[in-house]
C-alpha cells in the first residue's frame, strides 16, 4: 500500500512544483520524493523497507499519475542509499537518496529544489508547503493528481509534550501542525518547503493523521547536509 496522504489539502497547480517526485514500486505510487540534484532524489528510508523484491522507479515531471503529460518521465534507479543509521523501528534518520539511471532532463516541469544547509530551526508559525499523492481522506481515496497543503511549523517543545510525541522529536526533526490539514504515512519522503527552500522530508513512521495532538514529523535536511553532500559527491 502507498505510504502516506495529504489530508485537508487541495489539488496543486499543475507542474508548479517541478522538484516533486513519485517514488514507485512495480509501477504504483509508493512515496513522495524531491529532486535535489540532476541525478538524485531525496526520499524517506522507510519507503523501501518492503521493496526488496520489487522494481523501484522515480517519476518526474508529473501532475497526474495516470494521464499522459509531455514532461512526465519514469527513471530507473541506479542506486538506493538509505541513511546508515536509519532503522525500521524508529523515525530517526529517515532519509533515502536515490540515484537515477541518468541525469534528469530538466525543464519548466523538472527542476531540483534548493535545500537548506544552515542548521537552524524554522521559526514556529512559519507556513510551509507539503505536497504528495497520498490518500486524501480517512476512507482511503487516492488522488490521481498532486495535492498540497500549507502547514504552520510547530515548536519542538509542544511537539515533545506527552500528549503529542512525548520526547521523540530530536533536534534533527521538526513538526508541523496537524489540525485536520496534515501530511501522513504515504506522503512519506515528500518535501516540506518553506520560503522556496527544502527544509524537511515527511517521515514515514506510522501515526494518526489529522489529529492536532499528533503533529506531522519531518526530517530536517539541514541536519544531514554532510551526509547528503557525501553521497552526492
Amino acid at each position: 500500500p502507498p505510504r502516506g496522504r495529504i489530508l485537508g489539502g487541495r489539488e496543486a497547480e499543475a507542474h508548479a512544483r517541478p522538484y516533486m517526485a513519485s517514488v514507485q514500486l512495480n509501477g504504483a505510487h509508493l512515496c513522495g520524493g524531491v529532486l535535489v540534484a540532476e541525478q538524485w532524489v531525496l526520499s524517506a528510508a522507510h519507503c523501501l523497507e518492503d521493496a526488496a523484491d520489487g522494481k523501484v522507479q522515480v517519476l518526474l515531471g508529473a501532475h497526474s499519475l495516470s494521464q499522459p503529460e509531455p514532461s512526465k518521465r519514469l527513471y530507473d534507479v541506479l542506486r538506493a542509499v538509505p541513511h546508515p543509521d536509519s532503522q525500521p523501528d524508529t523515525i530517526d534518520h529517515d532519509l533515502l537518496l536515490l540515484q537515477l539511471s541518468e541525469k534528469a532532463t530538466l525543464g519548466p516541469a523538472v527542476r531540483p529544489l534548493p535545500w537548506q544547509r544552515v542548521d537552524r530551526d524554522v521559526a514556529p508559525g512559519t507556513l510551509c508547503d507539503v505536497a504528495g499523492w497520498g490518500i486524501v481522506n480517512h476512507a482511503g481515496r487516492r488522488p490521481d493528481s498532486l495535492q498540497h497543503v500549507l502547514l504552520p511549523v510547530l515548536d519542538r517543545a509542544t511537539c515533545n509534550r506527552r500528549t503529542h510525541h512525548d520526547g521523540a522529536i530530536t533536534e534533527r526533526l521538526m513538526c508541523a501542525e496537524s489540525n485536520r490539514r496534515d501530511s501522513c504515512k504515504g506522503d512519506s519522503g515528500g518535501p516540506l518547503v518553506c520560503g522556496g527552500v527544502l527544509e524537511g522530508v515527511v517521515t514515514s513512521g506510522s501515526r494518526v493523521c489529522g489529529n492536532r495532538k499528533k503533529p506531522g514529523i519531518y526530517t530536517r535536511v539541514a541536519s544531514y547536509a554532510a551526509w547528503i553532500d557525501s553521497v552526492l559527491a
Epitope: 514556529p124 515548536d155 519542538r156 517543545a157 509542544t158 515533545n160 509534550r161 506527552r162 500528549t163 510525541h165 512525548d166 520526547g167 521523540a168 522529536i169 533536534e171 494518526v208 489529529n211 495532538k213 499528533k214
Partner: antibody, heavy 116, light 112 residues
Amino acid sequence: EVQLQQSRPELVKPGASVKIFCKASGYTFTDYYMNWMRQRHGETLEWIGDINPNNGDPSYNQKFKDKATLTVDKSSSTASMELRSLTSDDSAVYYCAREGPSFAYWGQGTLVTVSA
Amino acid sequence: DVLMTQTPLSLPVSLGEQASISCRSSQTIVHSNGDTYLEWYLQKPGQSPNLLIYKVSNRFSGVPDRFSGSGSGTDFTLKISRVEAEDLGVYYCFQGSHVPPTFGGGTKLEIK
C-alpha cells in the same frame, strides 16, 4: 546527560515571597516543556503548572494560579518559579521536571520552609 | 480534577514475592487522541520520583522487566513480579490525559 539542578533550600517568613530556580543541562532547553510539582511532607505530589521555554507561555493548575508565577531565562537555560504570600501550608519540597518522555527527568527538589 | 485513588496505602511484602498496586481514576483517562496517559513513578526515601511505566504498560528505558503495568479506562494495576530490596519506596500513579494532571495518593512498599 540530562540534569536539572535546583536552587538551595529556603527559609522564609509568612507573607513573604520566594523564587526558586531549576537549571537545565545536557539537552536543548527550548525543546521541552518544564513542569513544577509540590510535595508536602509525607504527602503526594501536586502539579503546579508548566511553561514553554520557547515563548515563556505558562499554564497553571487553578489551585496555584494566585500562588505561583513561572518564568524562563533561555540565555541561562533556567526555569524559575516565584511563590508569593507564603503561609505554613506552602512549606514543601518543590520539584521541576522536564516533560518528554513523560516526567523522565526531575530536579533534586528545593525545600521551602515557611516559619516565623 | 481527576481523582486518582490508590490501594493499598501500605503494602508489606517479603523479598522475592509478587506485589500488586491498584489505581482507579474518577473518570476515564483516555485522551482525545486515543492514548491513555497513565504513568507509574517510584519515589525512594529522600529522592525525586523515577519514571517506571508510561502509557499504561510501557516500561521506561532501564526499568527491569519485573515491573509491568496493565489496565484501561479507569482501572489500572502495577505488578512487581519478584520484589527486590531496591524496589522499596512509595509508588505513585499519575494521569496526564486531563488538565490538571494528577497523582494518586501513593502506596508504600515495605518489607514484611
